[in-house]
């Protein structure tokens, strides 16, 4: 049980990993906070991400998900997730379609579909995890001022 009066530290129990994704596919990043009810912000190049046609944001208790839909070359780069004073950076690398599947001749039609209709694409390749940046971020916040600033 925490000491009364002490402010809890918002930290990640699971950090998003950098991924390589084929152009046109979605990229899904997952983070888990140690407690529920914690505000999480996702960033691209230091700017906060809002839910849109391009980005899907979801929370279920401690689980937080960012989906980048139909990734293209413009989506490649550095991303971050912030909870309180904890910030974790990760990267998205986009593989162009012709680089992903080089073909000399048209492939014959498959005899059977490899995935059920509506099935999620295969998981993207993981590139590993980047280290958290120094605590505290000076960027503008969607859910608050400088992350981790006491507000009670």
């Amino acid at each position: 049980m925490p000491e009364p009066g002490k402010k809890p530290v918002s930290a990640f129990s699971k950090k998003p990993r950098s991924v390589e994704v084929a152009a046109g596919s979605p990229a899904v990043f997952e983070a888990e906070t140690e407690r529920a009810g914690v505000k999480v912000r996702w960033q691209r190049g230091g700017s906060d991400i809002s839910a849109s046609n391009k980005y899907g944001l979801a929370t279920e208790g401690t689980r937080h998900t960012l989906t980048v839909r139909e990734v293209g070359p413009a989506d490649q780069g550095s991303y971050a997730v912030i909870a309180g004073s904890s910030k974790v950076k990760f990267d998205l690398k986009v593989i162009e379609a012709e680089k992903a599947e080089p073909m000399l001749a048209p492939a014959p039609a498959p005899a059977e579909a490899t995935g059920a209709p509506g099935e999620a694409p295969a998981p993207a390749a993981e590139l590993g995890e980047s280290a958290p940046s120094p605590k505290g971020s000076s960027s503008a916040a969607l859910n608050g001022p400088t992350p981790g600033a006491p507000d009670d």
Partner: antibody, heavy 120, light 112 residues
């Protein structure tokens, strides 16, 4: 001193429309706090209504709202509005403006409230 | 929607005594629970957040505990100023079910 102050309450007929305004002072409104509205019927408990993110891009409404209420905010005016339409007698309550914590979803600052009475 | 059931609806205790208020959630809310104190004609005041943390200025006589779906608020060494209505709030967030904030029905504390 950090303060919230609601205005715009009063008597309105069933089916009517009313807009409540919350004036923010004493803290940097543009720095990112989510702002919410909570109501309390006479002699009853608290009921969350809606919240809006700092950029106005994200909004949340309680499921029971069913599109009748709209929350908005103006960074230049330091205000948060709640537009209420198709009001019924059941909407009679004191309406509070509340600020969420920057790091979690609880409310750490409240306004004194404004009374809305829906009656013919 | 998450439903918060608070018991008892009312409790009476003497100055210097102890009261315990319970809050039961309809599902596990992972410690995303706050308690508020409200006096007549006033807005609620934050007492406890994240189940057991006290904001600065709140006396340590107020203690929160619990986990999963069951939570408690204990007020010890009761003072006349503690006479108020107390509310629990779940702030477990679920995008899929649109959960963000649910209050219990409140508990009136009467101090003799």
């Amino acid at each position: 001193q950090e303060q919230l102050e609601e205005s715009g309450g009063g008597l309105v007929k069933p089916g009517g429309t009313l807009t409540l305004t919350c004036k923010v002072s004493g803290f940097d409104f543009s720095s990112g706090y989510d702002m919410c509205w909570v109501r309390q019927a006479p002699g009853k408990g608290l009921e969350s209504i809606a919240c809006i993110g700092s950029s106005s891009a994200s909004t949340w409404y309680a499921n029971w709202v069913n599109g009748r209420f709209t929350v908005s905010r103006s960074t230049s005016l330091n205000t948060v509005d709640l537009k209420m339409t198709s009001l019924t007698v059941a909407d009679t309550a004191t309406y509070f403006c509340a600020r969420e914590s920057s790091t979690e979803y609880y409310y750490n600052l409240w306004g004194p409230g404004t009374l809305v009475t829906v009656s013919s | 929607d998450i439903v918060m059931t608070q018991t008892p609806a009312s409790v009476e205790a003497a100055v210097g005594g102890t009261v315990t208020i319970k809050c039961q959630a309809s599902q596990s809310i992972g410690n995303a629970l706050a308690w508020y104190q409200q006096k007549p004609g006033q807005p609620p005041k934050l007492l406890i957040y994240s189940t057991s943390y006290l904001p600065s200025g709140v006396p340590s006589r107020f203690k929160g505990g619990g986990s999963g779906a069951e939570y408690t608020l204990t007020i010890s060494d009761l003072e006349c100023a503690d006479a108020a209505t107390y509310y629990c709030q779940s702030y477990y967030v679920s995008t899929s079910s649109s959960d963000r904030s649910s209050f219990g029905g409140g508990t009136e504390v009467v101090v003799k």
